[in-house]
């Protein structure tokens, strides 16, 4: 039975030019984790896998960064970077458990953090 | 374009070890995780493990863990995969594949195998 | 390990005709957090290794042509192949992508009636 959840940094807002912080935690589990990728809805940007260690994909490299933790780094940020990033965390004997991430790039100056929320 | 250059047959002998060879050109090989998949007529294609060639990190499928082992060297842009203690068993074709950015287990790009026949 | 098993093991279809692949996974390959299944198809002719034809169970690779769809989700897939051409003889495979181990089915030889 799948008995954790996984916090996310929920809705997000961000300028443009500027870099933010994608994290998700995984708790309520005594599971292991095995890997960790972050996706958007049409391609791999990373994996973090227990034996491998961090992989950024290509496409990204120059302006993803692996970390804080689990967690990743996308920097030079621009319009086109708006939208659903997904956390999934493969786990044993678990097996998959994933969060959603909405960033929004703004133009403005202006750029507030949304809430925490859960996915249970 | 995208080549992965692997020698076409390898004979060995019971018992003996092998070590074969996946030679990458047409994009920068420590950006990409290569796997390893073997090919038997009665158990069908069976993915092996992979390997990050940037870090050396390995990840390997739990059924050949101890006999096979995946190494990289950069400054050649080639993969290894040893095979140890052959048996009858071991007699396939084996491949090397580049994974894909829609996916960490999706191969577009493949060697076109070693035949490796063990026989005394 | 996850288990896909194809269906049938091999298919005779005559040219211009419809041909259809069963696949089906031990478990779900749906994630239901991004509502992406990952399965793949491959297509291997003799002396060859296998060519990505399709992912996220209905994506088309580059190249591919459109008579190869894909369709399913969960644990229920299917390669369709709308007209048969004399070049799509070949063995197909289904994949699980969604775990470790990477599994693939058992393969369905496709020949020409």
């Known amino acids: 039975m799948m008995t954790g959840t996984i916090e996310t940094t929920g809705n997000i807002s961000a300028e443009k030019g500027g870099s933010i912080i994608l994290q998700c935690h995984l708790s309520s589990t005594t599971a292991q984790v095995t890997q960790v990728n972050w996706e958007q809805q049409d391609q791999l940007l990373a994996i973090c896998n227990a034996d491998l260690g961090w992989h950024i994909s290509p496409s990204f490299k120059d302006r993803v960064a692996p970390g804080p933790g689990l967690g990743l780094t996308l920097q030079s940020l621009t319009v086109n970077d708006t939208g659903e990033y997904f956390c999934i965390y493969h786990t044993y004997p678990d097996g998959t458990y994933t969060g959603r991430i909405f960033l929004e790039v703004l133009e403005s100056s202006v750029a507030e953090h949304g809430a925490r929320f859960q996915i249970p | 374009q995208v080549q992965l250059q692997q020698p076409g047959a390898e004979l060995v002998k019971p018992g003996a070890s092998v070590k074969m060879s996946c030679k990458a050109s047409?994009?920068?090989?420590?950006?990409?995780?290569m796997h390893w998949v073997k090919q038997t007529p009665g158990r069908g294609l069976e993915w092996i493990g992979a390997?990050?060639?940037?870090?050396?990190?390995?990840s390997y499928n739990q059924k050949f863990k101890g006999k096979a082992t995946l190494t990289a060297d950069k400054s050649s842009s080639t993969a290894y995969m040893q095979l140890s203690s052959l048996t009858s068993e071991d007699s396939a074709v084996y491949y090397c594949?580049?994974?894909?950015?829609?996916?960490?287990?999706?191969?577009?790009?493949w060697g076109a195998g070693t035949t490796v026949t063990v026989s005394a | 390990d996850i288990v896909m098993t194809q269906s049938p093991d091999s298919l005779a279809v005559s040219l211009g005709e419809r041909a259809t692949i069963n696949c089906k996974s031990s478990?779900?390959?749906?994630?239901?957090?991004?509502?992406?299944?990952?399965l793949a198809w491959y297509q291997q002719k003799p002396g060859q290794p296998p060519k990505l034809l399709i992912y996220?169970?209905?994506t088309r690779e580059s190249g591919v042509p459109d008579r190869f769809s894909g369709s399913g989700s969960g644990t229920d897939f299917t390669l369709t192949i709308s007209s048969l051409q004399a070049e799509d003889v070949a063995v197909y495979y289904c994949?699980?992508?969604?775990?470790?181990?990477?599994?693939f089915g058992g393969g369905t030889k496709l020949e020409i009636k």
């Open positions: 594949a580049r994974y894909h950015y829609y996916g960490s287990g999706l191969f577009p790009y």
């Open positions: 994949q699980n992508y969604h775990s470790y181990p990477f599994t």
């Open positions: 390997i990050n060639p940037g870090s050396g990190g390995t």
């Open positions: 996220g169970a209905s």
């Open positions: 478990q779900s390959l749906l994630n239901s957090g991004n509502q992406k299944n990952y």
């Open positions: 047409g994009y920068a090989f420590t950006d990409y995780l």
